[in-house]
Amino acid sequence: IWELKKDVYVVELDWYPDAPGEMVVLTCDTPEEDGITWTLDQSSEVLGSGKTLTIQVKEFGDAGQYTCHKGGEVLSHSLLLLHKKEDGIWSTDILKDQKEPKNKTFLRCEAKNYSGRFTCWWLTTISTDLTFSVKSSRGSSDPQGVTCGAATLSAERVRGDNKEYEYSVECQEDSACPAAEESLPIEVMVDAVHKLKYENYTSSFFIRDIIKPDPPKNLQLKPLKNSRQVEVSWEYPDTWSTPHSYFSLTFCVQVQGKSKREKKDRVFTDKTSATVICRKNASISVRAQDRYYSSSWSEWASVPCS
Amino acid sequence: RNLPVATPDPGMFPCLHHSQNLLRAVSNMLQKARQTLEFYPCTSEEIDHEDITKDKTSTVEACLPLELTKNESCLNSRETSFITNGSCLASRKTSFMMALCLSSIYEDLKMYQVEFKTMNAKLLMDPKRQIFLDQNMLAVIDELMQALNFNSETVPQKSSLEEPDFYKTKIKLCILLHAFRIRAVTIDRVMSYLNAS
């Protein structure tokens, strides 16, 4: 058993049929010695008396808010949560496996630039009685500070019969140099509590590996005289690291109709303009990627050919 | 401690081409190592990230773009003194700061060159003959060093009398390639910045 926060404790249980469970001793936070009784949750049934209460925690029915009283007055609470371990593996029931970029990916993180700011998000089908708390650091043995905000519900989607909820959090490394060469990864730890179930999820990454620029901005077309070709130009996104001559991007320019199966014109360039063939009912799209370290491509920025 | 903005004449920067070749060569070599050594811990997640130039050179700091010198987090100075007679710029405007930056890059390359050559000598003794260093990568390191054109004492190639542990050597190769790729990215960024300045 360990303390998650003040008066909240996590009991780690091997979860299998007829498991013996864990013996837990609760101590009432009071100078009083006599006349103390214990109850669980909203029940008025007295579980025991005395300054300490010993319980055998085997299942969720044994978890919950234990309260010690004296003469109708509440003295203190202890909330017990369960963390299940099945076949030596901690449960991951609360969050959905996003399976990208690989299986067992529960947390996904992205950074728009090298400033040390990043966003992580996760998915769940649970809508109520759910809380998250996020901690982060650079390295684990001698951790350097990363400050994370509160996790917030950022999107709701309907997937078949189920509703899916996306939560996200923003974090900022306390003293980040955009030009630094990372040797210790960022560690992100998410504590998830659903009712009386506790789970924790972690992700470890270098900022350089989670870079995904914003789409290029200010796409403009200029038809070329006596030609089917148009010159398309754009600018670096505002959120990208500066100077741009140091933090350079490379671009993919594509002309395609509405369907992905349609024929297309595609060209790659390090410049902020390119010449392509425009077709009726097609769109010109441009996306960006770090020129020197190939992490993710940005989303597309598009303009219609006409 | 940083790069001044008004430096080389545009298009007068032969090192840019060599640094692009360097990044390409080390990326190819790393990809080859990851494929060939698929049963060894050779991915970014599996290896320890070591920097053989740590406390010996200060490339990131010495080559910091002017715009980032206002960022206090970028200025944890590790001053190192370097020889300053580089000729990469083909321009007389080479400032002291730029020479410091370019000589730091030169020292990085020299250190990695020695490590890679020592390692290759060991890998050539491996009866499995599983992996060797790409000669193209070694040649590209050499070309960039020549383009930087700094005079400094040659570092003797480390020779070891004991029987090499090929497993450890291959793990070390992965560590070295990952670190060198990161440094090659920095070098490419620096050269691109200088070329644009």
């Epitope: 089917r228 349609e262 024929k263 060209v267 077709r279 | -």
Partner: antibody
């Protein structure tokens, strides 16, 4: 699967014209761009131009501008390349090729040998 | 127009050996570079597109790399059926142009 079958070999006199055909099967002609590339005996490859069968748009290499016409007949799934004012150095194998991407060549015809000789 | 240069013109390699073919552009063409194989009496065949992208059905021993001005086609272990002429082609701008080719012959 996608296939391109070209017309047979031709022998032409200098100053004449030649029209090579290229019949597409296994796909809808308008779904792909169509290019023509030629290869003189023992020489390399030379791009001549492309046509978009969907709308008849064409782009020709400057070298062939004014001397080449590329057309398509969607009813027969056939593309044509006509080269006029033939010279002896036009002697080559002419290939048609198709791709969903405009700038490289995925599916090739078997080639048509055109000999220009007096 | 962009004139592509391939080297060497002829490469003599023993079966089982590695072959490295080079293609150069006079200016940066990013990764707008494609590789073809042509055997005598046959039409060319696309091997690699956009410098390094492999094509299904093409053996894994063929790989491409490079960007900017220098590109490489590598055949990791030459098989008898790989002896042919190899062409690079740029798609950075029109007119599309090919390199002069590299003939890979048996040593």
């Amino acid at each position: 699967q996608v296939q391109l079958v070209q017309s047979g070999a031709e022998v032409k006199k200098p100053g004449a014209s030649v029209k090579v055909s290229c019949k597409a099967s296994g796909y809808t002609l308008t779904d792909y761009y169509l290019h023509w590339v030629r290869q003189a005996p023992g020489q390399g490859l030379e791009w001549m131009g492309w046509i978009d069968p969907e709308n008849g748009d064409t782009e020709y290499a400057p070298k062939f501008q004014g001397r080449v016409t590329m057309t398509t007949d969607t009813s027969t799934s056939t593309a044509y390349m006509e080269l006029r004012s033939l010279r002896s150095d036009d002697t080559a194998v002419y290939y048609c090729n198709a791709n969903k991407e405009l700038r490289y060549f995925d599916v090739w015809g078997q080639g048509t040998m055109v000999t220009v000789s007096s | 127009e962009i004139v592509m240069t391939q080297s060497p013109a002829t490469l003599s390699v023993s079966p089982g050996e590695r072959a490295t073919l080079s293609c150069r552009a006079p200016q940066s063409i990013s990764i707008n570079l494609h590789w073809y194989q042509q055997k005598p009496g046959q039409a060319p065949r696309l091997l690699i597109y956009f410098a390094s992208q492999s094509i299904s059905g093409i053996p894994a021993r063929f790989s491409g790399s490079g960007s900017g001005t220098e590109f490489t086609l590598t055949i990791s272990s030459l098989q008898s059926e790989d002896f042919a002429v190899y062409y690079c082609q740029q798609s950075n701008s029109f007119p599309l142009t090919f390199g002069g080719g590299t003939k890979v012959e048996i040593k």
